[in-house]
Amino acid sequence: GGTAEKWEETELDQLFSGPLPGRLPVNHRPFSAPHSSRDQLPPPQTGRSHPAHTAAPQVTSTASKLLPPVAFNHTIGHIVLSEHKNVKFNCSINIPNTYQETAGISWWKDGKELLGAHHSITQFYPDEEGVSIIALFSIASVQRSDNGSYFCKMKVNNREIVSDPIYVEVQGLPYFIKQPESVNVTRNTAFNLTCQAVGPPEPVNIFWVQNSSRVNEKPERSPSVLTVPGLTETAVFSCEAHNDKGLTVSKGVHINIKVIPSPPTEVHILNSTAHSILVSWVPGFDGYSPLQNCSIQVKEADRLSNGSVMVFNTSASPHLYEIQQLQALANYSIAVSCRNEIGWSAVSPWILASTTEGAPSVAPLNITVFLNESNNILDIRWTKPPIKRQDGELVGYRISHVWESAGTYKELSEEVSQNGSWAQIPVQIHNATCTVRIAAITKGGIGPFSEPVNIIIPEHSKVDYAPSSTPAPGNTDSM
């Protein structure tokens, strides 16, 4: 083993703890190749009739079973160093010429092959008896993620040879694997915060800090759970993690006290009809607790009326509600409130909204229909219905007249202005029944139709006096 300081910034050859090939001449220069692939070969060597990785002379497969075992030389077992330092280590092996088919050395960490961007160099030292191979591995500015067990692998004569592990331990300040998290809590209600930090070096001790003051006098071994009995106001918590290398402070987290929401803002009337108002709003601050539902309060805005408040409950989203079953042509005061688990917000400032005028609620009365045969017209008369103020201003009438005879059906309608209470329509079909219904119209819409009044239209010149009808629903009067 060793200590971090001992191995930091150490030269490559100082790390060769296995025996170097003593048979190499002093002036012999090894062949070197950056090692980025497990099968990289050394360059061809002059004076040899075979590549360095292939043993010579050739031997039979039976003979290979009798070859002496080949193993990696022993090397450093444990390297301890601080974060951000550089580290270099190696493994080496001597391959006699009697071996055939050797592959390059590959580096592995914690059971997984290291491919790609790792910095490794393989050096070959050939001589008459065989080849010595040294695989060098370096890591610049080590991080915690470089911690682990490194080893070399090589295939010799189809047999896998594995080196002893080199355990790299990167030490540094404590590293948080679980930091306290912001939570929203009910006033005076207990809650827990968790803090966990690791080395190496271990142990890691935890101090809790609330609003810049330490909570615990004695440190707790990581992981630590702090139980806070309850708060009355927002606080900031953090934890300090200490080990032999120093201290690390976690992020500070806000612990918010749940309160009632702020009232909704921007209450707007999006649309009004005779009997409904569509209202929208922007929710206020939620008080650190999700809004559960909202309440729309509605009351008649007439200062002299003593109408009670109507309350409509709706979900917190969408921020929209259609208030229904309202009176036509009326003013209403509207306010919105929303609630979370703590309670209801104040109501928004009251706003005023108006419904539009409605359609008439009653049909024209006393409908009579006369046939003016000489002019070939129907003369229709009625009485204006009693229209309430909220029904709006009368703008006219709609007359529906349906003509039926054998094999013929004709449905027509006319609109007439409100001036007067009579109308004339031309006869459409003879030898037929005509059914007349009338509805009043205001800006708010069309009202209900009157009960049908039927009149029989005879064939041409069969009568010389005017038939008439009276509003007896469903009856046919002909004269």
């Epitope: 803002t265 209450v267 309060q297 003593n306 408040v309 005061s333 400032p349 009251w350 005023l352």
Partner: antibody, heavy 116, light 111 residues
């Protein structure tokens, strides 16, 4: 007729608290907010906040958060405002007013004097 | 907060003449066709009395010589003809959003 009846004047010591009642009559108490307004001597009017008796929701002007607490007792149609940690700055007439668009009905006011 | 700037601070008007008091809002107090500005009259030792609500609506029981109008974010209270009993301090107030605020007041004197 809508009436809001407030209590008489209060003389309190600095640091103490006071609770001012406002009894409503002549209308359905829960149908209207109860707003509270402060008027220091010779000064303008300051809106303190309001409470909706229907749901108990309260809102306060930032200046009066922590100073005033509004509550209601629906059974007696009475609204209350508690003022705490009183200082000479809190010496004023305090009014309750029935909330709507425009305060059409006001209490007669309660004079709170803070003096050692 | 919406700031209401009231002017003038004091005003002296002859009996029978017109008194005009202005109130300017720092931003709009109107929405959905209504302006949430109100006018009050206050006499010494009494609570304020609502005169005009929603910028131009005369409160029940208030004499018709009081009227209110709006132009953008400028609101005006007119009293014409002024009577002796109109000597008082007048305040504007909005209820468009929280917090509600009042103007600083205009003291009207009659000569």
């Amino acid at each position: 007729e809508v009436q809001l009846q407030q209590s008489g004047p209060e003389l309190v010591k600095p640091g103490a608290s006071v609770r001012i009642p406002c009894k409503a009559s002549g209308y359905t108490f829960s149908d209207y907010n109860m707003d509270w307004v402060k008027q220091s001597h010779g000064k303008s009017l300051e809106w303190i906040g309001n409470i909706n008796p229907n749901i108990g929701g309260t809102i306060y002007s930032q200046k009066f958060k922590g100073k005033a607490t509004l509550t209601v007792d629906k059974s007696s149609s009475t609204a209350y405002m508690e003022l705490r940690s009183l200082t000479s700055e809190d010496t004023a007439v305090y009014y309750c007013a029935r909330g709507d668009y425009g305060f059409a009905s006001w209490g007669q006011g309660t004079l709170v004097t803070v003096s050692a | 907060d919406i700031v209401l700037t009231q002017s003038p601070a004091s005003l002296t008007v002859s009996l029978g003449q017109r008194a005009t008091i202005s109130c300017r809002a720092s931003r709009s107090v109107s929405t959905s066709g209504y302006s949430y500005m109100h006018w009050y009259q206050q006499k010494p030792g009494q609570p304020p009395k609502l005169l005009i609500y929603l910028a131009s609506n005369l409160e029940s029981g208030v004499p018709a010589r009081f009227s209110g109008s709006r132009s953008g974010t400028d609101f005006t209270l007119n009293i014409h003809p002024v009577e002796e009993e109109d000597a008082a301090t007048y305040y504007c107030q909005h209820s468009r959003e929280y917090p509600f605020t009042f103007g600083s007041g205009t003291k009207l004197e009659i000569k």
